[in-house]
Amino acid sequence: IWELKKDVYVVELDWYPDAPGEMVVLTCDTPEEDGITWTLDQSSEVLGSGKTLTIQVKEFGDAGQYTCHKGGEVLSHSLLLLHKKEDGIWSTDILKDQKEPKNKTFLRCEAKNYSGRFTCWWLTTISTDLTFSVKSSRGSSDPQGVTCGAATLSAERVRGDNKEYEYSVECQEDSACPAAEESLPIEVMVDAVHKLKYENYTSSFFIRDIIKPDPPKNLQLKPLKNSRQVEVSWEYPDTWSTPHSYFSLTFCVQVQGKSKREKKDRVFTDKTSATVICRKNASISVRAQDRYYSSSWSEWASVPCS
Amino acid sequence: RAVPGGSSPAWTQCQQLSQKLCTLAWSAHPLVGHMDLREEGDEETTNDVPHIQCGDGCDPQGLRDNSQFCLQRIHQGLIFYEKLLGSDIFTGEPSLLPDSPVGQLHASLLGLSQLLQPEGHHWETQQIPSLSPSQPWQRLLLRFKILRSLQAFVAVAARVFAHGAATLSP
C-alpha cells in the first residue's frame, strides 16, 4: 500500500482466483484514543472500533472511503483504491490501446517544435467517475523538471456503438535547450482513477522523435505565362522553431487529381516554392518535415488548382 | 578547411556533407526510426557517446559568439562514430549487405571530420569504449542503437552547418 496523495492510498493486488487478500491497517488521524468507530462510504454501519482498523482488501467491495468518527464527528478519511496485477502485468482497463505506432500504446505525444513544449493524449470509453493526473520529467534517475497542466477532455467521437473520449495534456520542459542533442528521454506518467480502480500509464520519448510540424502556411499559386505550370509558394508555420536557417524544414509538394485513383505527382524540396503542372480539377498540397531528422510529416496544406 | 586557432570552416562544404550524412544515417537503417531501442536496456555504448549538450555553444547565439567550441564538439563526435562504424560491431557477423550505406556513412564521417580538422592540428578526441559483443544478435542491437544515436548527432551537426553557411560564411 502506498499514498497517492493526502488521504488517498493505493492497494496493489495480485488478481487471480486463489490470491490471498492484502492486509491493511488503517489508523485514525487523531490524538483521541477511545470511542472511535469506522464506517465505509455512505453507509452509517459501524465496521469496527478503535484507533486502528485492520481489513482484508481482496475486492473492489473492500475499497472506498473509510471514515473514523467519534461522537458523530468525523475525525479523518482514508480513500482506498485498488491497482490490479494480473499474471504479473498491471491492468490497463481504463485507457484504450491506440496500437500506433505499436501495440500497447496508450499515450501518444507530439511536439510542434523544439521548444520543449509537447502535447500528449489518450483515449477511453469511460465517461464518468474518471480523473487523471499527469507528471513528467526529463530522465528518471536524476529527473529534470517538466511542468504539465491539467488533463482535459479534448474530443468525443462515436465509434460504432461506443462513444470514445479523448483527453489531452500540455507539458513544458522547464529549462528546454532546443539546439541540444537530447541524451535523456522525457518521461510522462499518467495516473488514472476510475471509481475505485487505479492505473498508471507511462511513455518515454525524445522530443526529436515526436516532432510533427504544423502545415506550411500562406500556400499560394502563381500561374506562369503561356504555360500550364504554376509556381507554388508557402511559408514556414508560425509554430516552428526559429531561426529557420538553423531549424530547417524540407517539403513535399503533391499534385492530386479529383479521383483518389489518379496518379499523384510529388516533388521534394528544401525551398519554400516549387514549379508544378496544375491539372484541371486537381489540388496542390504541401507538407513539411524536419530537414535533418526523419520525424513525422505535417498534415497537408492544400489549394485547388483552379 | 578549418584552420587552427579559430578561423571559419568551409561552412558550405560542411553543410552539404552533413546533410548527406543525415540522409545516409537514415538510409543505413530506416526501420530504426520505428524501434524503441530504449526498451532494450541502455548499454554503455550509447551512454558514452559524445552528445552535443546545452553548454557546447551549438545554438545560434553560441555559434555567433564563438563557433570553435561547437565545432570541436562536433569533431569529437565524428571521430567517435567513425571509429565505431569501423569497429567489429559493424565489420563482424552478421555481415552487412554489399549495398549497405554504412560504408558510405563511415567515409562521410571521416570526410567531414577532416574538413573540420586538417592534418597537423589536433583537437582532443574522446576515448572509444572497448566493445566486443559476443553474440551476433547483440552486435545487431548495438548497431541499431549506434545508428539511432548517430541520427540525432548528425541532425544537430547539420543544423549547425546550415546556419553557419547562411549566417557566418565570409
Epitope: P17, D18, A19, P20, G21, M23, L40, D41, Q42, S43, E45, L47, G48, L53, T54, I55, Q56, V57, K58, E59, F60, G61, D62, G64, Y66 | -
Partner: antibody, heavy 119, light 107 residues
C-alpha cells in the same frame, strides 16, 4: 435494521428452471456484496459465490460455476440465484448473505429458501 | 481449495461449562477466519470474524483465537441457548470454504 428477505419455498421437477430472490433493506445496498450458500439436507454449509451490486462483478466457487447464475437488480436492492435446468441433487436450503467489506465473511443472513427438486 | 477440519464432530457439555471447538486449515489463512452458529430451522449467525473479533451483539462469553492454520472458538460458560451447530469459515482464498461443523449438545 438490516434485513435480507428471501422468496418462499419452491417445489420443482428435474429440468425445470427457477429463480429465487433475496431482497435487502436497512443498509446501503451498493456498499455490500451479496453471497449465496447452499445447505443440503442434514449437511454442512457450502459457499456458492459472491457478487457486487455495483457492477455485477462475480466470484463463483468453481464447483458451482455453470450450474447456477447469480444476478442483481440495483433498483430494487434484490439479488437472484437461478437455475436453467434443475437436478434432483439441487435439492437444498439456499441462503443469501451480506458480505462484510474489508473482511469477506457473511455478517447478515437471509432466512433461507428451500428448493425441492423431485419427479 | 482450502480444507477446514473441525474437531470434535460432536461435543457434549453441560450449561455453565467451558466449551472449546478447534478448526484446522489445510494451508495458512492468516487471521481471515469466521465462526458461525446455526440452530435447527434457522439461518447461520455470525459470531466471530478475523479470528478473534466479536461480532456486534454477540455475548462476551464467545471468544476466538489463533492464526495461520490453527483456530479455536471458546464459550467460557455455556448457556442453554448455546447448544447448536458451529461452523468455521476461511475467507482468505477463493473459493471461501466452511468446516464440516461441530454439534454442541447438552450432556
Amino acid at each position: 435494521e438490516v434485513q435480507l428477505v428471501q422468496s418462499g419455498a419452491e417445489v420443482k421437477k428435474p429440468g425445470e428452471s427457477l429463480k429465487i430472490s433475496c431482497q435487502s433493506s436497512g443498509y446501503s445496498f451498493t456498499t455490500y456484496w451479496i453471497g449465496w450458500v447452499r445447505q443440503m439436507p442434514g449437511q454442512g454449509l457450502e459457499w456458492i459465490g459472491i457478487m457486487s451490486p455495483v457492477d455485477s462483478d462475480i466470484r463463483y466457487n468453481p464447483m458451482f460455476r455453470g450450474q447456477v447464475t447469480m444476478s442483481v437488480d440495483k433498483s430494487s436492492s434484490t439479488a437472484y440465484l437461478q437455475w436453467s435446468s434443475l437436478k434432483a441433487s439441487d435439492t437444498a436450503m439456499y441462503y443469501c448473505a451480506r458480505r462484510r467489506p474489508g473482511q469477506g465473511y457473511f455478517d447478515f443472513w437471509g432466512q433461507g429458501t428451500m428448493v425441492t427438486v423431485s419427479s | 481449495e482450502i480444507v477446514l477440519t473441525q474437531s470434535p464432530a460432536t461435543l457434549s457439555a453441560s450449561p455453565g461449562e467451558r466449551a472449546t471447538i478447534s478448526c484446522r486449515a489445510s494451508q495458512s489463512v492468516s487471521s481471515w477466519l469466521a465462526w458461525y452458529q446455526q440452530k435447527p430451522g434457522q439461518a447461520p449467525r455470525s459470531l466471530i470474524y478475523a479470528a478473534s473479533n466479536l461480532q456486534s451483539g454477540i455475548p462476551a462469553r464467545f471468544s476466538g483465537s489463533g492464526s495461520g492454520t490453527d483456530f479455536t472458538l471458546t464459550i467460557s460458560s455455556l448457556e442453554p441457548e448455546d447448544f447448536a451447530v458451529y461452523y468455521c469459515q476461511q475467507y482468505n482464498i477463493y473459493p471461501f470454504t466452511f468446516g464440516q461443523g461441530t454439534r454442541l449438545e447438552i450432556k
